[in-house]
């Protein structure tokens, strides 16, 4: 069986992670969706997760984590603002179903965050426009305590770092042998 | 097959403004990031800022910060890109880009992967 | 902001040669980086995608390859049609980043 792909993001501390993962627009719209880590060895662990149902172009924000789901385009937002050193690691997009297994979105994605070039502030927005401005209506969603019943079979590529995860945290499985089919317009 | 059309050529005065405009046919437009990249004659590309329509945030190179702002229209799948307090350095061939990237996580996967044909801007008292 | 530095920045070949192009970007930036042909008059093409994809109707006589900092572009036989100018550009982050060009020109 073929392994997850990932595709792998190199940014400075204070920069932004901003990524989509799509989605079956039919199937998932108004599904609750989850921003996850995976650490080696471990279960995927829940970072921030949106409303359920989730609501449309409505930002949820936990931490330094921006989730907003547009269900007219089958994509959830992702963003990571003013990412630190320890942010760096492996992450998934998934989609709560229960009873059945959470639904991963491709690709995992991953973050590696390096300490910005010495005598130059950290951020990237000295260089580009302040865009990722966090929305001032932002609500915090609860994520549900969800564990699979599944066991992890093999543990995923080693991440570089842990991440701080909000209280609401939790357990799901690690999903594999999936693989990523590019889709051409 | 998306394609990406622009506005017709523009002379304008030192200190002006000028608003080149990129229309989208053939595909989604909302998800695209559209980049604009200008060439001086001589010069190589240059990258000056994008947009994601359906965010309605833009991005903008430090050179142009303050001078360029990208908008875009969704309702007419329409961006645009102005540049103010016009000098002679700013003469250029002005092209518009789509950067894609369906059943990936990044919104520019596949690059800058279609090109408006260029708007070509003279400035010159 | 990330810079990219091609080189060389001029290069002389004959139709048949194999041709490579470098890119050097100043930081790591994984496989976001895409290579471009532009010929006077005209918008530029893309070539190449993620590093290593060939773009649909590229011919497949160009081809990438690198990851991180280093990346290269090669054209196997070159075609007269091939003459131009040829541009990398990272999009990891923003503000995206060109290359300053190589041009390719007849010997």
């Known amino acids: 069986a073929t392994k997850l792909t990932e595709e792998k993001y190199e940014l400075k501390e204070g920069q932004t992670l901003d990524v989509k993962c799509d989605y079956t627009l039919e199937k998932f719209a108004s599904s609750q969706k989850a921003w996850q880590i995976i650490r080696d060895g471990e279960m995927p662990k829940t970072l921030a997760c949106t409303e359920r149902p989730s609501k449309n172009s409505h930002p949820v924000q936990v931490g330094r984590i921006i989730l907003e789901d547009y269900h007219d385009h089958g994509l959830l937002r992702v963003r990571m603002v003013n990412l630190q050193v320890e942010d760096s690691g492996l992450y998934q997009c998934v989609i709560y179903q229960p009873p059945k297994e959470p639904h991963m979105l491709f690709d995992r994605i991953r973050l590696v965050v390096t300490k910005g070039f010495s005598g130059t502030p950290g951020s990237n927005e000295n260089s580009t426009q302040n865009v990722y401005k966090i929305p001032p209506t932002t609500t915090k969603a609860l994520c549900p305590l969800y564990t699979s019943p599944r066991t992890v079979t093999q543990a995923p590529p080693k991440s570089t770092a842990d991440v701080s995860t909000p209280d609401s945290e939790i357990n799901l499985t690690n999903v594999t042998d999936i693989i990523r089919v590019p889709v051409f317009n | 097959q998306v394609q990406l059309v622009q506005s017709g050529a523009e002379v304008k005065r030192p200190g002006s403004s000028v608003k080149v405009s990129c229309k989208a046919s053939g595909g989604t437009f909302s998800i695209y990031v559209i980049s604009w990249v200008r060439q001086a004659p001589g010069q190589g590309l240059e990258w000056m800022g994008g947009?994601?329509?359906?965010?309605?945030?833009?991005n903008y190179a430090q050179k142009f910060q303050g001078r360029v702002t990208i908008t875009a229209d969704e309702s007419t799948n329409t961006a645009y890109m102005e540049l103010s307090s016009l000098r002679s350095e700013d003469t250029a061939v002005y092209y518009c880009?789509?950067?894609?990237?369906?059943?990936?996580?990044?919104?520019?996967?596949?690059?800058?992967?279609?090109w408006g044909q260029g708007t070509t801007v003279t400035v010159s008292s | 902001d990330i810079q990219m530095t091609q080189s060389p920045t001029s290069l002389s070949a004959s139709v048949g040669d194999r041709v490579t192009i470098t890119c050097r970007a100043s930081q790591g930036i994984s496989s976001w980086l895409a290579w471009y042909q532009h010929k006077p008059g005209k918008a530029p093409k893309s070539l190449i995608y993620?590093?290593?994809s060939l773009q649909s109707g590229v011919p497949s006589r160009f081809s990438g390859s690198g990851s991180g900092t280093d990346f290269t572009l090669t054209i196997s036989s070159l075609q007269p049609e091939d003459f131009a100018t040829y541009y990398c550009q990272q999009y990891n982050s923003y503000p995206y980043t060109f290359g300053q060009g190589t041009k390719l020109e007849i010997k």
């Open positions: 880009a789509r950067g894609h990237g369906p059943g990936s996580s990044h919104y520019s996967y596949y690059g800058l992967d279609v």
């Open positions: 947009i994601i329509p359906l965010f309605g945030t833009a």
């Open positions: 993620a590093a290593s």
